[in-house]
Interface confidence: low
C-alpha cells in the first residue's frame, strides 16, 4: 500500500495557506481586505473583547459537531449580544415572588437593531451564568407565548459546580419568530423542572444579574454578565449579494 | 475551471461496484459469502421482516445526519428486539390507577440473551406506537431508578395525528446500565409534563399495548406493536474479532 | 480516530490530520484582523489506498476497509472529518465587527 | 446542496452525487442478502478546482470558493456529506439475522 | 549571511535572448518567494517577475508577459530569468530579490535582501 | 508614470525630521514598504508592512499608513540618510507589485 510520489509537504502547507486567504475573504464577501486608515488606535473596546470571548468559548450544552452546512452557513455570520431588559424595570413587578422561576426580558426593537430581518438570522443562544451552587437540580426553560401562557422549550439537568459556569441555550426559532412579529417585549421563564407528585418546586438555581441578592450588582462590571442574546447574523448588505448570486456557479 | 481528463463513467461505476463487495463483506467480517446450503425454504418469517421493517422505516424523534463513526461503529450491527414484559404481568398492578403516567417494563434476562455484554450494545430505542389523537401533549419519559425513584431522560411534543405514528427513544446509555447490573425487572415510565402551576396533568396519550381500552389485543397480531426496545449490537463472536485487531492498520 | 491526538503524536505515513499554524501577518500579510492573531487551522494529508477487493486474499484487504476505504469510494480521498468555527474580530471603518467563520480548524480527518 | 434533487436533474460536470443502483443478484452474483435485493448506493465524481487565489482577479474566484474549495483544501476532492445506513436480512446456517450496515447510501456530496 | 549574486547580463540586439542567474546562499532558498525587479538608467524600480518557492507557480509584468521567463533550482539554490525578443525599453539592472516571509505570496510582502544587480543593454 | 505618487524631492535640515508620502494603487487595503538606494547601489529595506523596521536599521526611521496614504518619517535626520526612498505595495486592480517613482532626499 506504499505510494510512489513524495509528497512536497512545504508545498501543500503554502497550497492551503494561499487557499485560506481566498476562504476568509470568500466568507466575508470581500475582494481584498478591508482599509485599516480609519481604525482607531489603541486596543480593542471593552465589549468588543467580551463579545469575542463569548464566541470563542464553549459553554455548557453547545455541540462542538459541525452540520452538513447549507450554503448560506458558508458565509461569515456578524456576531452581536442583546442585553437583558434591567431589572428595575417594571416588567419585572409580578413576578417577584415566584419561587419556581426566575424571568429574562427582551426589547424586539434591540434585537431588531442587530438582525433587520428574520431570515438573516442563523443562530439565536440565550447565555446565562449560574452562579457557584452545591445543588442538582432539572431545570427548564420556557418561551412567553401570549398573556398568560408559556411554551416549553428545553431543559438541562445541572449538576454541582464550584464556579461560576455559563449555559446556553438555542433559541434560534423563538427569535426569529420575534422578528416576524411587531415591536415590544418578549421574555423567557428559566424553572424548576416541576414532577408531577413532588412537593418542592423552588428553584434552586442562581443566575447571576437576575437572583435577588446579586441585584446591587448591575450598573457595575456584573452589568455584562447578565442573561443576553448572543446572535449570528448574515449582515444586511453580504445577504442582499447573497441572494443576486443565488444562481448555481 | 475543466478539466482536461475524461472521466471513464463505466470504469468508475465498476470500482465503486468492486469496492462495495469488500465494503458489506468487512462490515460483516466475513471472508466470503456465507454459505447457503442451511437456508430453509420459504418466504423469511414474519418476525424477521418485521424486525427489518422497523429497522428500515425513519421515525419520530429519529436523526437522518451522520454522525463521525468511531471505529467500532464501521462494523455492521445485528438488529434484535426485545418485547415489554406482558401488562398481566403483576408488576403494573400497583400503577393502574395513575392518570398521569403509563408504565413498560422490560425483562433484563431477554436483553441480555441478546447483548451478552455491555460494551456490544451501540444503540437501543424504546419505540412506542402512538394512537390516532386530536390534542397537542408534552411528555416525558423516565427511567425507574431505585424503589421509588425515577430519572428524567427526554421529552416530546406530541401533535395532533390522523393515524397511529412510531415513537423512538434512544436509552442506549439505559439499557447498557442494564446490562451492567443483575438480572431483573426494568422500567421506563411514560408521563404527562407537569408543569408548575398547571392542574391538569393527565395522560392524553394512547400507546398501543398499554391503554386500557386495548388491554384485550394482548395475545393477538397487536402484540408484535406493543412496546419494544430495538437493539443494535455488535454479535459477541465479531466483538472479540475486533478486539484482537484493535491495532492501528 | 485520525484526530490531532492520534496524528499529532505519530508519525503516520497515512492520511491523517497534519499540524499547521497560520499567523495572519506573517502567512498572509494581514493586520486587519485583530483577533485572534492567528489558529491552527491544520489540513488533512496522506494516502487513502484503494482496495479492490478482488486483487488479492480477501482475509489480507478486508481488516484495511476500515481505514484505508470505509465508504467504499471509486477513488478514496484524505478530507475532514471534524471541523469547529473560528470567530474573528475586524474593522470596517471605524466599527469593529465580531464575526464566526464556519468550518475552519481541521480537527480529525477520514478516507471518504 | 449537491444533493440528489439537484444533481439527479441536472448535466453537472463539476462534483456532484451520481446515480449507481446495486443489484446484488446481477452486479456482486450474490444470493445470500435476502432482503433487500439491492440499494441506490450512489457515488460522488467531479472535479474541484483548486482556486489559487492569485492566479486571477479576486472578484471572479471568491464567487467560486463556497462550491469548489470551501474546506480551502490543498487539493480539494469531492466526497459524500450525507450518507444513511442500510439494514439487510441474511442467513447463518439456519438463523436469519438483520443488521444494519452504517453510512451505505450517499444521499449529497461536497467538495471537501 | 544572506547573499545574492547576479550573473548573465551584458550587450544584446534587439530580438536576442539571455538568461540570468541568481545564485543565493546563507538561507533556505526552497522556502521563500523570489522576485526579479528592473530600474533603467536614472529611473525607478520597476517589477518584473516572481516565482513561488516551489515554482509552481510564476507572475509577470505585462511589459514582459509571453517574452521572459522565470525559473529556480532549488536543488541548486539558483533563481533564473530567460529573456528572449528583447526591446531597448529591456535595457536596465536586474536585481534579484527575496522575500521578507516564508509560505507568503511576494506580491504583498517586502524584500529584504536584494542581490547587486547585473546590466542589461539592449542596442543595436 | 508609477501607480504610486511620491514626490521627487524631500529636502530637510541635518537633524531635522523628514516626511516622504506615498498615494495610490491599494494603499488603502494593503501594506506599504520602503528602500533606500544610493547611487550605484541596489536598493536596502528600512520599513516592511508599514511600521515594522529591520534589523540594522537605526531607529530613527519609522513608517506609518492612514487611508491611502503611507508614509516614511526620518526622526533627526543624518547626511548618511541621504539617497533615494522607493515605497512599494500591491496594486490590486493590476495584481501585481508596485513602486513608487522615489523620492530624492537631501540633508542639508
Known amino acids: 500500500l506504499s505510494t510512489c510520489k513524495t509528497i512536497d509537504m512545504e508545498l501543500v502547507k503554502r497550497k492551503r495557506i494561499e487557499a485560506i486567504r481566498g476562504q476568509i475573504l470568500s466568507k466575508l464577501r470581500l475582494a481584498s481586505p478591508p482599509s485599516q486608515g480609519e481604525v482607531p488606535p489603541g486596543p480593542l473596546p471593552e465589549a468588543v473583547l467580551a463579545l469575542y470571548n463569548s464566541t470563542r468559548d464553549r459553554v455548557a450544552g453547545e455541540s462542538a459537531d459541525p452540520e452538513p452546512e447549507p450554503e448560506a452557513d458558508y458565509y461569515a455570520k456578524e456576531v452581536t449580544r442583546v442585553l437583558m431588559v434591567d431589572r428595575n424595570n417594571a416588567i419585572y413587578e409580578k413576578t417577584k415572588d415566584i419561587s419556581h422561576s426566575i424571568y429574562m426580558f427582551f426589547n424586539t426593537s434591540d434585537i431588531r437593531e442587530a438582525v433587520p430581518e428574520p431570515p438573516l438570522l442563523s443562530r439565536a443562544e440565550l447565555r446565562l451564568q449560574r452562579l457557584k451552587s452545591s445543588v442538582e437540580q432539572h431545570v427548564e426553560l420556557y418561551q412567553k407565548y401570549s398573556n398568560n401562557s408559556w411554551r416549553y422549550l428545553g431543559n438541562r439537568l445541572l449538576t454541582p459546580t464550584d464556579t461560576p459556569e455559563w449555559l446556553s441555550f438555542d433559541v434560534t426559532g423563538v427569535v426569529r419568530q420575534w422578528l416576524n412579529q411587531g415591536d415590544g417585549i418578549q421574555g423567557f421563564r428559566f424553572s424548576a423542572h416541576c414532577s408531577c407528585d413532588s412537593k418542592d418546586n423552588k428553584l434552586h438555581v442562581e443566575i447571576n444579574g437576575i437572583s435577588p441578592k446579586r441585584r446591587g450588582d448591575l450598573g457595575t462590571i456584573h452589568d455584562m454578565n447578565r442573561p443576553f442574546l448572543l446572535l449570528m447574523a448574515t449582515p444586511l448588505e453580504r445577504a442582499q449579494h447573497l441572494h443576486s448570486s443565488r444562481h448555481r456557479r | 475551471l475543466s478539466t482536461c481528463k475524461t472521466i471513464d463513467m463505466e470504469l468508475v461505476k465498476r470500482k465503486r461496484i468492486e469496492a462495495i463487495r469488500g465494503q458489506i463483506l468487512s462490515k460483516l467480517r466475513l471472508a466470503s459469502p456465507p454459505s447457503q446450503g442451511e437456508v430453509p425454504p420459504g418466504p423469511l418469517p414474519e418476525a424477521v421482516l418485521a424486525l427489518y421493517n422497523s429497522t428500515r422505516d425513519r421515525v419520530a424523534g429519529e436523526s437522518a445526519d451522520p454522525e463521525p463513526e468511531p471505529e467500532a461503529d464501521y462494523y455492521a450491527k445485528e438488529v434484535t428486539r426485545v418485547l415489554m414484559v406482558d401488562r398481566n404481568n403483576a408488576i403494573y398492578e400497583k400503577t393502574k390507577d395513575i392518570s398521569h403516567s403509563i408504565y413498560m417494563f422490560f425483562n433484563t434476562s431477554d436483553i441480555r440473551e441478546a447483548v451478552p455484554e455491555p460494551p456490544l450494545l451501540s444503540r437501543a430505542e424504546l419505540r412506542l406506537q402512538r394512537l390516532k389523537s386530536s390534542v397537542e401533549q408534552h411528555v416525558e419519559l423516565y427511567q425507574k431508578y431505585s424503589n421509588n425513584s425515577w430519572r428524567y431522560l427526554g421529552n416530546r411534543l406530541l401533535t395532533p395525528t390522523d393515524t397511529p405514528e412510531w415513537l423512538s427513544f434512544d436509552v442506549t446509555g439505559v439499557v447498557r446500565q442494564w446490562l451492567n447490573q443483575g438480572d431483573g425487572i426494568q422500567g421506563f415510565r411514560f408521563s404527562a409534563h407537569c408543569s408548575c402551576d398547571s392542574k391538569d396533568n393527565k395522560l392524553h396519550v394512547e400507546i398501543n399495548g398499554i391503554s386500557p381500552k386495548r388491554r384485550g389485543d394482548l395475545g393477538t397480531i397487536h402484540d408484535m406493536n406493543r412496546p419494544f426496545l430495538l437493539l443494535m449490537a455488535t454479535p459477541l463472536e465479531r466483538a472479540q474479532h475486533l478486539h484482537s485487531s484493535r491495532h492501528r492498520r | 480516530a485520525l484526530d490531532t491526538n492520534y496524528c499529532f503524536s505519530s508519525t503516520e505515513k497515512n492520511c491523517c490530520v497534519r499540524q499547521l499554524y497560520i499567523d495572519f501577518r506573517k502567512d498572509l500579510g494581514w493586520k486587519w484582523i485583530h483577533e485572534p492573531k492567528g489558529y491552527h487551522a491544520n489540513f488533512c494529508l496522506g494516502p487513502c489506498p484503494y482496495i479492490w477487493s478482488l486483487d488479492t486474499q480477501y482475509s489480507k484487504v478486508l481488516a484495511l476497509y476500515n481505514q484505508h476505504n470505509p465508504g467504499a469510494s471509486a477513488s478514496p480521498c484524505c478530507v475532514p472529518q471534524a471541523l469547529e468555527p473560528l470567530p474573528i474580530v475586524y474593522y470596517v471603518g471605524r466599527k469593529p465587527k465580531v464575526e464566526q467563520l464556519s468550518n475552519m480548524i481541521v480537527r480529525s480527518c477520514k478516507c471518504s | 446542496a449537491l444533493d440528489t434533487n439537484y444533481c439527479f436533474s441536472s448535466t453537472e460536470k463539476n462534483c456532484c452525487v451520481r446515480q449507481l443502483y446495486i443489484d446484488f443478484r446481477k452486479d456482486l452474483g450474490w444470493k445470500w442478502i435476502h432482503e433487500p435485493k439491492g440499494y441506490h448506493a450512489n457515488f460522488c465524481l467531479g472535479p474541484c478546482p483548486y482556486i489559487w487565489s492569485l492566479d486571477t482577479q479576486y472578484s471572479k474566484v471568491l464567487a467560486l470558493y463556497n462550491q469548489h474549495n470551501p474546506g480551502a483544501s490543498a487539493s480539494p476532492c469531492c466526497v459524500p456529506q450525507a450518507l444513511e445506513p442500510l439494514p439487510i436480512v441474511y442467513y447463518v446456517g439456519r438463523k436469519p439475522k438483520v443488521e444494519q450496515l452504517s453510512n451505505m447510501i450517499v444521499r449529497s456530496c461536497k467538495c471537501s | 549571511q544572506v547573499q545574492l549574486v547576479e550573473s548573465g547580463g551584458g550587450l544584446v540586439q534587439p530580438g536576442g535572448s539571455l538568461t540570468l542567474s541568481c545564485a543565493a546562499s546563507g538561507f533556505t532558498f526552497s522556502n521563500y518567494y523570489m522576485t526579479w525587479v528592473r530600474q533603467a538608467p536614472g529611473k525607478g524600480l520597476e517589477w518584473v517577475s516572481s516565482?513561488?518557492?516551489?515554482?509552481?507557480?510564476?507572475y509577470y509584468a505585462d511589459s514582459v508577459k509571453g517574452r521572459f521567463t522565470i525559473s529556480r533550482d532549488n536543488a541548486k539554490d539558483t533563481l533564473y530569468l530567460q529573456m528572449n525578443d528583447l526591446k531597448s525599453e529591456d535595457t536596465a539592472v536586474y536585481y534579484c530579490a527575496k522575500n521578507i516571509y516564508t509560505y507568503y505570496t511576494a506580491h504583498y510582502a517586502g524584500m529584504d535582501y536584494w542581490g547587486k544587480g547585473t546590466l542589461v543593454t539592449v542596442s543595436s | 508614470q508609477s501607480a504610486l505618487t511620491q514626490p521627487s524631492t524631500v529636502s530637510v535640515s541635518l537633524g531635522q525630521m523628514a516626511r516622504i508620502t506615498c498615494q495610490g494603487g491599494?494603499?488603502?487595503?494593503?501594506?506599504a514598504h520602503w528602500y533606500q538606494q544610493k547611487p550605484g547601489q541596489a536598493p536596502v529595506l528600512v520599513i516592511h508592512d508599514d511600521n515594522s523596521r529591520p534589523s540594522g536599521i537605526p531607529e530613527r526611521f519609522s513608517g506609518s499608513r492612514s487611508g491611502g496614504t503611507a508614509t516614511l518619517t526620518i526622526s533627526g535626520a543624518q547626511a548618511d540618510d541621504e539617497g533615494v526612498y522607493f515605497c512599494h505595495s500591491y496594486d490590486s486592480s493590476a495584481n501585481a507589485p508596485v513602486f513608487g517613482g522615489g523620492t530624492e532626499l537631501t540633508v542639508l
Open positions: 516565482i513561488y518557492s516551489t515554482g509552481s507557480h510564476t
Open positions: 491599494s494603499l488603502g487595503s494593503y501594506d
